[in-house]
Interface confidence: medium
């Protein structure tokens, strides 16, 4: 978080400078600003014509006003005394990514339990102190997401802790105490993910020296797919500010903008269900993990259960899973029916069911890579049968895939994007259905959505458990 | 289709308070900029105020500030401009836009979807 | 602030001609600039971003050029449509964003 570039001259020139200086102070500047831009905004130092510090052409100024405008600065295209100091400051070393808060491409984690180890302790702390420090900062993030983060302390974990000092083996060398403090990478394998942080800088658990805390907060959200934000309350505000750690919230950017690459907590997860009883069917939080037409009726299912409703009649009944596919599992994470088949498809983790007319058919599981997902697609979270295209539409995270029934395969160009293709629908589905010819009902935590796919809209909002009278 | 639609503009007296909301569909409200832009009768246009996409920061013209305030519920993709300490000066059409950005610089461009506006007059 | 300055302020001309409007800026503003139509009784419309582009769905007798302080919209040859006040704004030095006082295109 609290990085700073080398400083070229320690000092700030006062009043607004013109790119045409030719004193050494404003050289230093202008040099200073270059770099800074170059690293943080993309500046491509080798397009701009110089002579004796004279740029033409706007692309200095553009980047500079490109700066000034995402961090909440007076827009004026020059190196004035707020936007040195601001280059100054102390600061993340990661690239501002502008209006979209996601990392450049946009990676995200594919899977929703994600393992961390801490490679090395720093000696400023006791070991417990890091521990805590780092496991309250994946705390933060998973209060707000469906997200779980395991420490492990040996093998390969996904995000990987490291305290280190200058060259580091990473071609972004730390730069001594006050220099930049830490980077993390997005995720991805490998070195995707990591979180590094600057061994000579003085880590602490209170607002003396850096704070391991919030800088951890900051850095994992890069871990997990986050970019800066310009929002100056946001933790991925790219300068550092100490704030009380004991009143510490994030702010409405960063929980936006993490709930836009994977969804906000299941309802099921913020209110566990640990005896596995019955859910109160008119439970205004109630969720569903999946739901399908079978028929005239729609199955609902959660945990272990199913209620069944006959479409355009009140009356609603729960059973349990078991009784009626004895071979099935519990938590059904996805369904969908071919009516003109007679068959449902059941999915949890990377298996699949098929049922005929009611009975589950014998061979069965079946892996779901057998449709024709890549490896990293591991479970899926809905799923939806449109007759008229005679097309299936699988939702994983924040992404969908369409399949051919009739081809038996996977239609090119796919995964795309739920939120660029289904308006209003945020990514991280936990079910859906088709009804009445013309609606997909979308279910997320304890709301449902029902989009025209004709309008391609949401038309209505509702509570999950608005089919059962309640 | 892309849409902004203001309403609770309305005679005032001076000193008098209104908040004016604009209603946005048909695009996903909270990634965007948004703007207040005004126009007296028989005038040019004149830049009010900005908000970023999460409502973190805001701009305010030196003609409203410390009267007006601009926010944003995501939620209910909805615009709001609170203006207190109302003068017969700030009689005019009150315009919400949106701004959009370069795709590669992230600057403001220009405000490409305008609501209709609403009619905010101030009299005694 | 940036002043801008439209001139001339209004413009009589018929049907199929040119028209060349002109907006010049206090100090410099590199490129940009905007230009927005707007008729009677309507919210303004984008036209031209960053000088020199045309907004989606302009008809291409609009056009804009300059840089620096001295910009022009040009509509090469008049509809009916495009009676209407021509307003241009900077977004170079802000805040404040500053729009121009308008030229009106009125038919001769």
């Known amino acids: 978080m609290k990085f700073l570039l080398i400083l070229l001259l320690q000092a700030t020139a006062s009043g607004a400078l013109p790119l045409n200086s030719s004193t050494s102070l404003e050289k230093n500047n202008v040099l200073f600003g270059e770099r800074y831009l170059e690293k943080f905004y993309g500046l491509e130092i080798n397009k701009l014509p110089v002579t004796k510090m004279k740029y033409s052409g706007n692309l200095m100024k553009e980047k500079i006003q490109e700066m000034q405008h995402f961090l909440g600065l007076k827009v004026t295209g020059q190196l004035d005394t707020s936007t040195l100091e601001m280059m100054h400051a102390p600061r993340c070393g990661v690239p501002d990514v502008h209006h979209f808060r996601e990392m450049p491409g946009g990676p995200v984690w594919r899977k929703h339990y994600i393992t961390y180890r801490i490679n090395n302790y720093t000696p400023d702390m006791n070991r417990e102190d890091v521990d805590y420090a780092i496991r309250k900062a994946f705390q933060v993030w998973s209060n707000v997401t469906p997200l779980k983060f395991s420490k492990i302390n040996t093998g390969m974990a996904d995000i990987l802790v490291v305290f280190a000092r200058g060259a580091h083996g990473d071609f972004h060398a730390f730069d001594g105490k006050g220099g930049i403090l830490a980077h993390a990478f997005g995720p991805g394998s490998g070195i995707g993910g990591d979180a590094h942080f600057d061994e000579d800088e003085f880590w602490t658990t209170h607002s003396g020296g850096t704070n391991l805390f919030l800088t951890a907060v900051h850095e994992i959200g890069h871990s997990l797919g986050l970019g800066h934000s310009s929002d100056p309350k946001a933790v991925m505000f790219p300068t550092y500010k100490y704030v009380d750690i004991n009143t510490f919230r994030l702010s409405a950017d960063d929980i936006r903008g993490i709930q836009s690459l994977y969804g906000d907590p299941k309802e099921n997860q913020r209110l566990p269900n640990p005896d596995n009883s019955e859910p109160a069917l008119c439970d205004p939080n109630l969720s569903f993990d999946a739901v399908t037409t079978v028929g005239n009726k729609i199955f609902f299912f959660k945990d272990r259960f199913f209620w069944l409703k006959v479409s355009e009649r009140p009356k609603t009944s729960v059973n349990l899973i078991s009784s009626l596919w004895p071979t099935l599992p519990s938590g059904i994470e996805a369904a969908y029916e071919i009516e003109a088949r007679n068959q449902v498809f059941l999915f949890k983790d990377d298996k699949y069911w098929l049922i005929s007319n009611l009975r589950p058919e014998p061979n069965y599981p079946k892996s779901i890579h057998s449709f024709g997902f890549p490896n990293f697609v591991k479970k899926i979270d809905a799923a939806v049968f449109n007759p008229r295209f005679y097309r299936t539409y699988f939702f994983v995270d924040n992404q969908y895939w369409r399949y051919d029934e009739r081809r038996q395969m996977m239609d090119p160009g796919y995964p795309k994007l739920i939120t660029k293709n289904f308006q209003g629908i945020g990514p991280k589905i936990d079910a859906v259905f088709y009804s009445k010819n013309k609606y997909y009902y979308f279910f997320q935590g304890s709301n449902q959505f029902e989009y025209d796919f004709l309008l391609q809209r949401i038309t209505k909002t509702l509570k999950s458990n608005s089919w059962f009278g309640c | 289709e892309v849409q902004l639609l203001e309403s609770g503009g309305g005679l005032v007296q001076p000193g008098g308070s209104l908040r004016l909301s604009c209603a946005a569909s048909?695009?996903?409200?909270?990634?965007?900029?948004m703007t207040w832009v005004r126009q007296a009768p028989g005038k040019g246009l004149e830049w009010v105020s900005y908000?970023?996409?999460?409502?973190?920061?805001?701009v305010y013209a030196d003609s409203v500030k410390g009267r007006f305030t601009i926010s944003r519920d995501n939620s209910k993709n909805t615009l709001y401009l609170q203006m207190n300490s109302l003068r017969a000066e700030d009689t005019a059409v009150y315009y919400c836009?949106?701004?959009?950005?370069?795709?590669?610089?992230?600057?403001?461009?220009?405000?490409?979807?305008w609501g209709q506006g609403t009619t905010v007059t101030v009299s005694s | 602030d940036i002043q801008m300055t439209q001139s001339p302020a209004t413009l009589s001309l018929s049907p199929g001609e040119r028209a060349t409007l002109s907006c010049r800026a206090s100090?410099?503003?590199?490129?940009?600039l905007a230009w927005y139509q707007q008729k009677p009784g309507q919210a303004p419309r984008l036209l031209i971003y960053?000088?020199?582009n045309r907004a989606t769905g302009i008809p291409a007798r609009f056009s804009g050029s300059g840089s620096g302080t001295d910009f022009t919209l040009t509509i090469s040859s008049l509809e009916p449509e495009d009676f209407a006040v021509y307003y241009c704004?900077?977004?170079?030095?802000?805040?404040?964003?500053?729009f121009g006082g308008g030229t009106k295109v009125e038919i001769k």
């Open positions: 704004q900077q977004r170079s030095n802000w805040p404040p964003l500053t």
């Open positions: 960053d000088a020199s």
């Open positions: 908000i970023g996409p999460s409502g973190g920061r805001t």
């Open positions: 836009a949106l701004v959009s950005q370069g795709e590669i610089s992230g600057l403001p461009y220009g405000m490409d979807v």
């Open positions: 100090q410099s503003v590199s490129s940009n």
């Open positions: 048909g695009f996903t409200f909270s990634w965007y900029e």
